[in-house]
């Protein structure tokens, strides 16, 4: 009889994760009698995948019934393939004995597993930043194979170019991970903006995966403050308004001070949203002029999103208000203007970063 050969016809097989892999093997002779075993890898550390003779291999099924008369087909099917199954598989013929003796191996079939990347997860900065600042967003996706992968960043549909991407590990592995960090410059209009991380891979059939993050989680838009006085009312009461505009997020505390003493504290809640996602808030304070001998210094103090308080002051001139009548009012508007406020805020952020 001709000498037995063990034929593994495919040098390589590629399978999508979750599917079954068929590894083909045939022997050219019934002689010598003895079982087939399948191993992954070679040498003393090789892993037994299937033995015709003994063992329990729940994921492995022989393609041909081993009890079939004159069987020379020793192909196997491995179910529910995962990236951990990648490797080179060898069909090995044993000669009957006590114990059975290894006789001849096939040339091996390399199994590569096509595994989809996990849904990209985009994470933003731990602390909020204000407009004109640059913040970093990180995108991560794991468990894909093969290694080749494409990642793009978008902000409101526009592709970004300032990002750095790494695929790990650098060497051969059963599966890979990608991590990319994009730098995004914030503007005051970014409350409704979104960054998108898009991952394209051979397993996705041209339908990339996307992960998103809302810039609303990363941005702080400081408020503009304006304090104004309405005309004197007949009952010698002056209505002073503090308008807090264009801020985000909503977390804001407003305190009125009369001559440095706390008069009232309010917390912003359930405010209507502006088109751009920011909020406005107006607070009124009624000052009884007749109760004061001297001018009253009113201060609107705003603490926004845990940042240092910002003040806007306004002086109500008592001398300009005869006690029995209320016509003209003389008021002095003092305190930081809007640009100063923003400068203060910027300084505050530089201090934190």
């Amino acid at each position: 009889e001709e000498e037995l050969q063990v034929i593994q016809p495919e040098k390589s097989v590629s399978v999508a994760a979750g599917e079954s892999a068929t590894l083909n093997c045939t022997a050219t002779s019934l002689i010598p009698v003895g079982p087939i075993q399948w191993f992954r890898g070679v040498g003393p550390g090789r892993e037994l995948i299937y033995s015709q003779k003994e063992g329990h291999f729940p994921r492995v099924t022989p393609v041909s019934d081993p009890t079939k008369r004159n069987n020379m087909d020793f192909s196997i099917r491995i179910s529910n393939i995962t990236p951990a199954d990648a490797g080179t598989y060898y069909c090995v013929k044993f000669r009957k004995g006590s114990p059975d003796v290894e006789l001849k191996s096939g040339a091996g079939t390399e199994l590569s597993v096509r595994a989809k990347p996990s849904a990209p997860v985009v994470s933003g900065p731990a602390v909020r930043a204000t407009a004109e600042h640059t913040v970093s967003f990180t995108c991560e996706s794991h468990g894909f194979s093969p290694r080749d992968i494409t990642l793009k960043w978008f902000k409101n549909g526009n592709e970004l170019s300032d990002f750095q991407t790494n695929v790990d590990p650098a060497g051969k592995s059963v599966s890979y991970s990608i991590r990319s960090t994009a730098r995004v410059v914030l503007t005051r209009r970014d409350v409704h903006s979104q960054v998108i991380c898009e991952v394209a891979h051979v397993t996705l059939q041209g339908d990339p995966l996307r992960g998103t993050a809302n810039l609303s989680e990363a941005i702080r838009v400081p408020p503009f403050l304006e304090v104004t006085q309405q005309s004197m009312r007949a009952d010698n009461q002056v209505n002073v308004t503090c308008q807090v505009t264009k801020f985000y997020p909503q977390r804001l505390q407003l305190t009125w001070l009369e001559n440095g003493n706390v008069s009232r504290t309010e917390m912003a809640s359930a405010l209507p949203e502006n088109k751009d996602g920011t909020y406005n808030w107006t607070s009124w304070l009624l000052v009884n002029v007749s109760a004061h001998r001297d001018d009253v210094k009113l201060t609107c103090q705003v603490e926004h999103d845990g940042q240092p308080a910002v003040n806007k002051s306004f002086s109500v001139k008592v001398s300009a208000h005869p006690k029995e009548q209320g016509s003209n009012t003389a008021a002095e508007n003092t305190g930081t203007n809007e640009r100063d406020y923003k400068d203060d805020d910027d300084k505050h952020h530089h201090h934190h970063h």
């Epitope: 009698v33 003779k53 081993p66 009890t67 079939k68 004159n70």
Partner: antibody, heavy 119, light 110 residues
Framework: QVQLVQSGAEVKKPGASVKVSCKAS????????INWVRQAPGQGLEWIAM????????HYNQIFKDRATLTTDTSTSTAYMELRSLRSDDTAVYYC????????????WGRGTLVTVSS | DIVLTQSPDSLAVSLGERATINCRAS??????????IFWYQQKPGQPPKLLIY???NLDPGVPDRFSGSGSGTDFTLTISSLQAEDVAVYYC????????FGQGTKLEIK
């Protein structure tokens, strides 16, 4: 290593039935045929039947087709051979044997079970 | 059914001499290039033991003084130099169809 351990000797009356067991170890029970062979005192070997434990496919010698039934219990890796309507000429040693090469041969044998049929 | 006929029924051979046992099938037991004949040795009080498979292949552990030959319908088991422990009954078996055994050949020392 492959082992086939058979049940103990039986004495039966004519017309009765006997069920001989064969417990396999050292290999995957469902991957190999089990054969049953008998040998009357001072006589030659007589093939009875064979069974594939994976799906209970059986092949019988026509002589025994109506009286013998082969079964397996894969949970205990045990094969059984029941012979009904026993006659005195059924007195024999009954062997189970495993076919290691799927060649319908008998590579490994149990030690045999003596069944004596006597009134 | 294929009938196997062994000859002789019994045989006495001197120690160290060659012993030859024949097995003839009532029709060919060859298929796909293989000869489906097997030889067994049975010693008193023991189960049979496989010696030769597919006509000419020595089962592992069997001394190489045993050999098998033949094709089609005529087959031979040869013991090149008889040893005392070879005293036994020898059976041929075919598996071209469902198995049957030859009637056996008793081998003794002369």
């Amino acid at each position: 290593q492959v082992q086939l351990v058979q049940s103990g000797a039986e004495v039966k009356k004519p017309g009765a039935s006997v069920k001989v067991s064969c417990k396999a170890s050292g290999y995957t029970f469902t991957n190999y045929w089990i054969n049953w062979v008998r040998q009357a005192p001072g006589q030659g070997l007589e093939w009875i039947a064979m069974i594939d434990p994976s799906d209970s496919e059986t092949h019988y010698n026509q002589i025994f087709k109506d009286r013998a039934t082969l079964t397996t219990d894969t949970s205990t890796s045990t094969a059984y051979m029941e012979l009904r309507s026993l006659r005195s000429d059924d007195t024999a040693v009954y062997y189970c044997a495993m076919d290691y090469g799927s060649l319908y041969a008998m590579d490994y044998w149990g030690r045999g079970t003596l069944v004596t049929v006597s009134s | 059914d294929i009938v196997l006929t062994q000859s002789p029924d019994s045989l006495a051979v001197s120690l160290g001499e060659r012993a030859t046992i024949n097995c003839r099938a009532s029709k060919s037991v060859s298929s796909s290039g293989y000869n489906y004949i097997f030889w067994y040795q049975q010693k008193p009080g023991q189960p049979p033991k496989l010696l030769i498979y597919l006509a000419s292949n020595l089962d592992p552990g069997v001394p190489d003084r045993f050999s098998g030959s033949g094709s089609g319908t005529d087959f031979t088991l040869t013991i090149s130099s008889l040893q005392a422990e070879d005293v036994a009954v020898y059976y041929c078996q075919h598996s071209r169809e469902l198995p049957t055994f030859g009637q056996g050949t008793k081998l003794e020392i002369k």
